[in-house]
């Protein structure tokens, strides 16, 4: 008689996660070789230790903190960059602008990147059918914990001035619920952040209006200036040329407004 | 216990090339990449390249570029480094060594004479 | 290349002293640098990583410290078993580099 299994609402753990993952490591070791200390197999050990036997939805940031340790990771503070909604751009960006960083550049981040994975209570399996959704099921599953304890230590090793590149195209350019607005804004640390600037992308080829007004916007200033930050915004009106320019930044056509 | 253990000692004339093999066990071959060092006689340490055993992407010091090849076989987890057009300053102990821990072989002496 | 340049090259020293080792690095480097340490016909043995921290079993009198460009390896009581040559090595970027050594002997 097969046992009966949790059925959540979310995808199943990602096939070949394990392998994944250990694969992923090594390679962040190849290409970063100044986490060549890292032990790829702890850091699985680790990993796989926040949530194998455990409910899915019981998850706490202190089950994540073996793994934390093992890949703690000093980026440049004044070189983080921040995003919502608009991961693929500013992967773009740090992948030529190779000093400034985001989540998914530190080891952590990318270990995880676009992964999902869960277990089950009492088991040591992994859930290759379903996993719980943050919305339909809880918000204390595997991943969204992941997520959040990693953004929050991240924005809390923030310092100077900090780097948000947010969607225009989207209704809401800031929302306060996603994990930007829910957990990044409000762990920079005012007596190291001095400044927190935005850079809003724009989507269409004629949208030349100034989204930086955005009531949204607006409303992220209000956040941080009560939090003793400073605040600015800049339009990314066209982000293609924005991006050849930071490969080019000699190139004439530069110096002109993007 | 993780153990790295190199091939024997190899004399080989100027022009000739050498594989000094590098068989690894006691941890899982593929986690931890591999990279090679050398030991002229009476010198310091010089770094030579490093191997992803996983993909076998390579990354060689310059100065050996087009001469050194770092290779794997996984099924026998074993890590091999070969050295062409040897000369007499190519004398030396070879070392491979796994990242994370620092475990070491015993190290390859290859000595290149006429 | 980043070069690494290590000093003394060599020195001489008693059981009980405590003796200091300095690297520099001609750029910076952040913490990845390690340090090794060469018995006479044995393989290096590394005996700390990311410039501060000391890998198990590594005796406690043995500290590195420093980021950026300079770095320093001290032994806090030095034994009669520390002779040996010692060498740092960094590894931020490739190709990795060592220093040229230090030749430790006992008095």
């Known amino acids: 008689v097969p046992r009966w299994r949790q059925q959540w609402s979310g995808p199943g753990t990602t096939k070949r996660f394990p392998e994944t993952v250990l694969a992923r490591c090594v390679k962040y070791t190849e290409i970063h070789p100044e986490m060549r200390h890292v032990d790829c197999q702890s850091v699985w050990d680790a990993f796989k230790g926040a949530f194998i036997s455990k409910h899915p939805c019981n998850i706490t940031e202190e089950d994540y903190q073996p793994l934390m340790k093992l890949g703690t990771q000093t980026v440049p503070c004044n070189k983080i960059l921040l995003w919502s909604r608009i991961k693929d751009l500013a992967h773009q960006f740090t992948q030529v602008q190779r000093d400034m960083f985001t989540l998914e550049d530190t080891l952590l981040g990318y270990l995880a990147d676009d992964l999902t994975w869960c277990g089950e209570f009492n088991t040591s399996k992994i859930n290759y059918q379903s996993c719980p959704d943050w919305r339909k099921d809880c918000s204390n599953n595997p991943v969204s914990v992941f997520w959040k304890t990693v953004s929050r230590r991240f924005a809390e090793a923030a310092c100077d001035v900090v780097h948000v590149m947010l969607n225009g195209s989207r209704s809401k350019i800031f929302d306060k619920n996603s994990t930007f607005g829910s957990v990044e804004v409000h762990n920079l640390q005012p007596e190291k952040v001095q400044t927190l600037e935005a850079w809003v992308i724009h989507g269409g080829r004629e949208d030349s209006r100034d989204l930086c007004q955005d009531p949204t916007i607006k409303e992220l200033e209000s956040i941080i200036s009560k939090r003793n930050i400073q605040f600015s915004c800049k339009n990314i009106y066209r982000p293609d040329k924005f991006l050849q320019c930071v490969k080019n930044p000699e190139d004439s056509s530069c110096t002109s407004e993007i | 216990q993780v153990q790295l253990v190199q091939s024997g000692a190899e004399v080989k004339k100027p022009g000739a090339s050498v594989k000094v093999s590098c068989k690894a066990s006691g941890y899982a071959f593929t986690t931890y990449l591999v990279e090679w060092i050398r030991q002229r006689p009476g010198q310091g340490l010089e770094w030579m390249g490093v191997?992803?055993?996983?993909?076998?992407?390579?990354n060689y010091a310059q100065k050996f570029q087009g001469r050194v090849t770092m290779t794997v076989d996984r099924s026998s987890t074993t890590a091999y480094m070969e050295l062409s057009r040897l000369r007499s300053d190519d004398t030396a102990v070879y070392y491979c060594a796994r990242y994370a821990y620092g475990y070491w072989g015993q190290g390859t002496l290859v000595t290149v004479s006429s | 290349d980043i070069q690494m340049t290590q000093s003394p090259s060599s020195l001489s020293a008693s059981v009980g002293d405590r003796v200091t080792i300095t690297c520099r690095a001609s750029q910076n480097v952040g913490t990845a640098v390690a340090w090794y340490q060469q018995k006479p016909g044995k393989s290096p043995k590394q005996l700390i990583y990311?410039?501060?921290n000391r890998y198990t079993g590594v005796p406690s009198r043995f500290s590195g410290s420093g980021s950026g460009t300079d770095f320093t390896l001290t032994i806090s009581s030095l034994q009669p078993e520390d002779l040996a040559t010692y060498y740092c090595q960094q590894y931020s970027t490739y190709p990795f580099t060592f220093g040229q050594g230090t030749k430790l002997e006992i008095k």
């Open positions: 191997i992803n055993p996983g993909s076998g992407s390579t």
């Open positions: 990311s410039a501060s």
